[in-house]
Every structure is written in structure tokens, then in C-alpha cells.
């Protein structure tokens, strides 16, 4: 059984079948003798009880108030009352877009990653038994699909799949033809999944320096938005007043990832700064990656093969 209409604010398009189902339906069956009433109020008009005589377009079935179809003048507040139970809805009926097969206010947007599973299923459980046929349109052009009862698209997404998909259910009621439209705006995007962050450049870097001078060690990484990049050095970070971590710089790549750079500035280089590891680490949910810098005196350069040097 179709479950109840829980949302208190509802917007529908003129000319379509529509229903309100109260949320104490199971309870209502248990106390069938109880008086159950539907009311409408709009503007200055106070509560007016609804019954099939109110309008040829209105039908009452057990727990449901049906509109065949809903029209602009049905806008207003609706109430269901039974004993001490009341449920209220605010109904807003909007104009149909005459220039399109759907109304923009009634669109459900979904973003799907390319190559990921993508599906459109045209179903309407409440009106299922009354539906003669259902058509699926893409950007208001009918798609030729095998199943005309519940047309479905199930595939791995491609960029060409992007567009507005409208399921149009055609149904008969009291000799009249009606249709109900449900539209999805499907956007296909690049893979959004996280990358394994990587530090750029060699893992071990010897940097030639002169005592008393300054040096800037640049650590760069390609990472995800929530990943962090930091420096580790000495017994306790920050114990050397001559060592400063500069503010991290980040630039977003076209793929939606980040290029980050963090500089470690060492001023007035002393003997204590030589031949120790300055480690730069990038940390993510998937683990860490570290690269190391070692400061060596320019005079000692000859002892180290040229290919391990960084300026």
C-alpha cells in the first residue's frame, strides 16, 4: 500500500491527477465507525467540508482525497480530521509550462559520476493500476524503449547521458485521459573519488647551504581537500626559534583535486641544522607519504653524488 502524504507543503502542477493520503490510515480502519472529515480553507474562506458533491473533480476513498485533476483554484490549506487526530497540508497549485514537457519547479536533480551506475525508473505506485502506458522523454524527445509500462534506463553513465529525463504516465479515469510527469535533471561529472595523495619530487633531498644564511624548503603535494600537509623536525617542533613554517598555499586543479605547497624557512643556519632530517608529510584517510630534506655544508658537496642535490 502507498504510504501517506507526510510533507506539509506540497506544490503540484495544474491539470495532473493528485492525491492527499493522511498518516493515520491504519488507525482509521480500526475505528471505521469514527467520523472522518476533509476540509479546505483558502484566503478569507473558513473551513469548508469537502465531499464528492463539492466538485466533480474530487473523490474520497478511505484515507485519500483525490483530485481529477488538480486545478489552480485548489490552492489552499487542507485538513483531515478524525476524533482528536488532525493532519494539515498547504497545497500550492502552479501553472503548467506550456512551452516544455515539464515544469522547472517540479525537477529532481541528481549528479552521477561518469562510468558509475546510472538509472531512471518510471514508476508510480499509487496510480499503477490505472496507468495505460508510460513514456520516457529525454530533453522532451521521446526515447524508444522496450517496456512501455515501466520504462527504465540502467547503465554505466556517459557524458552524453546528461539531460532532463521526464517520465510521463498516461492514465484513464471516468473516460478521461490524464497524465502525470516526473522529471529528473541528470548531470554527469568526472570521477569525484579520492586520489592517493602524492608528494612531488624525490623522497630524499640534500640541500647545499652556507652557515649564517637562510634557506626555504618547499614541499608540494597533489591531494584531496581534507588531506593535510605538515613538517616534522628535531626532537620537538618549534624548539628552534630560527625555523618557521609558512602558511600553506592551495590551488584547485581542473579535476577538483588540490595542489598544496608548504614552505619551511630556516634562518641563520647553524651547525645544529646540518645533517638532520626535515620531514614533510602528507596525511590522508588512506595513509601517509613522507619526503625528507637534509642540509649539508656547501664545502662538503663533493662527497655527495650530484643527482641527489636540490637547490
Amino acid at each position: 500500500a502507498e504510504s501517506c502524504t507526510s510533507r506539509p507543503h506540497i506544490t503540484v502542477v495544474e491539470g495532473e491527477p493528485f492525491y492527499l493520503k493522511h498518516c493515520s490510515c491504519s488507525l482509521a480502519h480500526e475505528i471505521e465507525t469514527t467520523t472522518k472529515s476533509w476540509y479546505k480553507s483558502s484566503g478569507s474562506q473558513e473551513h469548508v467540508e469537502l465531499n464528492p458533491r463539492s466538485s466533480s473533480r474530487i473523490a474520497l476513498h478511505d484515507c485519500v482525497l483525490e483530485f481529477w485533476p488538480v486545478e489552480l483554484n485548489d490552492t489552499g490549506s487542507y485538513f483531515f480530521q478524525m476524533k482528536n487526530y488532525t493532519q494539515k497540508w498547504k497545497l500550492n497549485v502552479i501553472r503548467r509550462n506550456k512551452h516544455s514537457c515539464f515544469t522547472e519547479r517540479q525537477v529532481t536533480s541528481k549528479i552521477v559520476e561518469v562510468k558509475k551506475f546510472f538509472q531512471i525508473t518510471c514508476e508510480n505506485s499509487y496510480y499503477q493500476t490505472l496507468v495505460n502506458s508510460t513514456s520516457l522523454y529525454k530533453n522532451c524527445k521521446k526515447l524508444l524503449l522496450e517496456n512501455n509500462k515501466n520504462p527504465t534506463i540502467k547503465k554505466n553513465a556517459e557524458f552524453e547521458d546528461q539531460g532532463y529525463y521526464s517520465c510521463v504516465h498516461f492514465l484513464h479515469h471516468n473516460g478521461k485521459l490524464f497524465n502525470i510527469t516526473k522529471t529528473f535533471n541528470i548531470t554527469i561529472v568526472e570521477d569525484r573519488s579520492n586520489i592517493v595523495p602524492v608528494l612531488l619530487g624525490p623522497k630524499l633531498n640534500h640541500v647545499a647551504v652556507e652557515l649564517g644564511k637562510n634557506v626555504r624548503l618547499n614541499c608540494s603535494a597533489l591531494l584531496n581537500e581534507e588531506d593535510v600537509i605538515y613538517w616534522m623536525f628535531g626532537e620537538e617542533n618549534g624548539s628552534d626559534p630560527n625555523i618557521h613554517e609558512e602558511k600553506e598555499m592551495r590551488i584547485m586543479t581542473p579535476e577538483g583535486k588540490w595542489h598544496a605547497s608548504k614552505v619551511l624557512r630556516i634562518e641563520n643556519i647553524g651547525e645544529s641544522n646540518l645533517n638532520v632530517l626535515y620531514n614533510c608529510t602528507v596525511a590522508s584517510t588512506g595513509g601517509t607519504d613522507t619526503k625528507s630534506f637534509i642540509l649539508v655544508r656547501k664545502a662538503d658537496m663533493a662527497d655527495i653524488p650530484g643527482h641527489v642535490f636540490t637547490r
Epitope: 502507498e2 510533507r7 507543503h9 506544490t11 498518516c23 519547479r105 517540479q106 536533480s109 541528481k110 549528479i111
Partner: antibody, heavy 121, light 111 residues
Framework: QVQLVQSGAEVKKPGASVKVSCKAS????????MHWVRQAPGQGLEWMGT????????YYNQKFQGRATMTVDTSTSTVYMELSSLRSEDTAVYYC??????????????WGQGTTVTVSS | EIVLTQSPGTLSLSPGERATLSCRAS??????????MHWYQQKPGQAPRLLIY???NLETGIPDRFSGSGSGTDFTLTISRLEPEDFAVYYC?????????FGQGTKLEIK
Amino acid sequence: QVQLVQSGAEVKKPGASVKVSCKASDYTFTSNWMHWVRQAPGQGLEWMGTIDPSDSYTYYNQKFQGRATMTVDTSTSTVYMELSSLRSEDTAVYYCTTSGDYDADRYFDVWGQGTTVTVSS
Amino acid sequence: EIVLTQSPGTLSLSPGERATLSCRASKSVSTSGDSYMHWYQQKPGQAPRLLIYLASNLETGIPDRFSGSGSGTDFTLTISRLEPEDFAVYYCQQSRELPLSFGQGTKLEIK
């Protein structure tokens, strides 16, 4: 009338995972979208992602992509949010909340009571 | 991603005064006559509460001293005459596109 009831508070160690549940009562579960919003102590609201119970479609805030997983059990009208590789910054109150499925109706008129997740070693 | 910026960060007023809170979006959140901007109130230890939906519609049960206005990128929440229970944090939220997003909040405090 409409209620969202969340699971109880959790205390987790860094690196662990947490799974929070949210049970919906008395309403059209599959025609509404379910969302997760978190709030760190003294901070603002942060939208984590959403699930459409009708087809299990999910969309995550990029910040939580790959770390958050939202699932649904339509037989019990329950949605779940699992967050992995927890760190201290994930200490927050996690709310489930519901909206309509149309873009215009994706505002949150019903909220769960919140689940406090504390990440501490 | 649409970024929402609320101002001021904190607003100090007295009961009875008029409060005007602003929310600016990094791109338009309006389409076909509708503005997909919503406002919430949150008090300490409580879940947020919907006040205004679609820029100007008052949620059921919310006092009519609350009103919302604006379109495109600029939106305003107005409280015509502050009551003691109105002092709280207020958030705007957009639903024009995924990912959905909130503003950072405006704290309304008693002067």
C-alpha cells in the same frame, strides 16, 4: 507526527569507524530524501550528503567522499551513515533530516534528535 | 559549489528591536520565479528549526514577526520585533544545486 529517531552517542578511537542510524516513523519514506548534517562543538552546520531511499542514490559533500557511506533499509524505514578513518575533528553532533525530492523542496523541516560522536584516543 | 556568506557574524540587539540578517550566495539560487533559499533557527543543545522556506514562505507554527525576502544572490531574514526567545543562531541554506550548503551562521545576542 513525523519523527526521526537516531541511535545513541558513540565514543570512538582515531582511525575507527562509526555507524549512526536514523529511523523514520509514520510517513512516506521513499518519496523523501534523507540527509546528514553535522555540527562540531561551537561550529556551524555542515551538510554531509544525501540518500534517496526510493533507489538508494547517494550524493556526498566532496569533503566526505570516500569516507562517508549512506545506506537505507526500506523494510524498517531506516537510513544509516557510516564514517570511517575517524579523527578528532570528526567529534560532532550528527543529525539526520528529511526533505522533499524536488530541488525546490530540499529544505529540512524534520530533524532527528542528533547523535553525539566523540573521537578521542 | 554555492558558497553562502552570512552577515553580520554577531548581531547585538534588545528585545522589541528589529533584526535584519543577511545571506549572500556566490551565484544565483533563483529560477522561474522561485528562490531556493531557506532559513533556520538553532538554540543551544537543540536541532535546527525551519523558519522560512523558498525565500519568503513562513513555516507552519512560526510567528509572523519572522519574514524572508530576496532573490538571485541576496537574501534577508527580518524579525520585526524581537522577543526574548528569538535570541539564537540563524542559518541560511540553499537547495538550488548539489551539494547543498549552509551559511556560517549569524548569532543574535541580547545587547
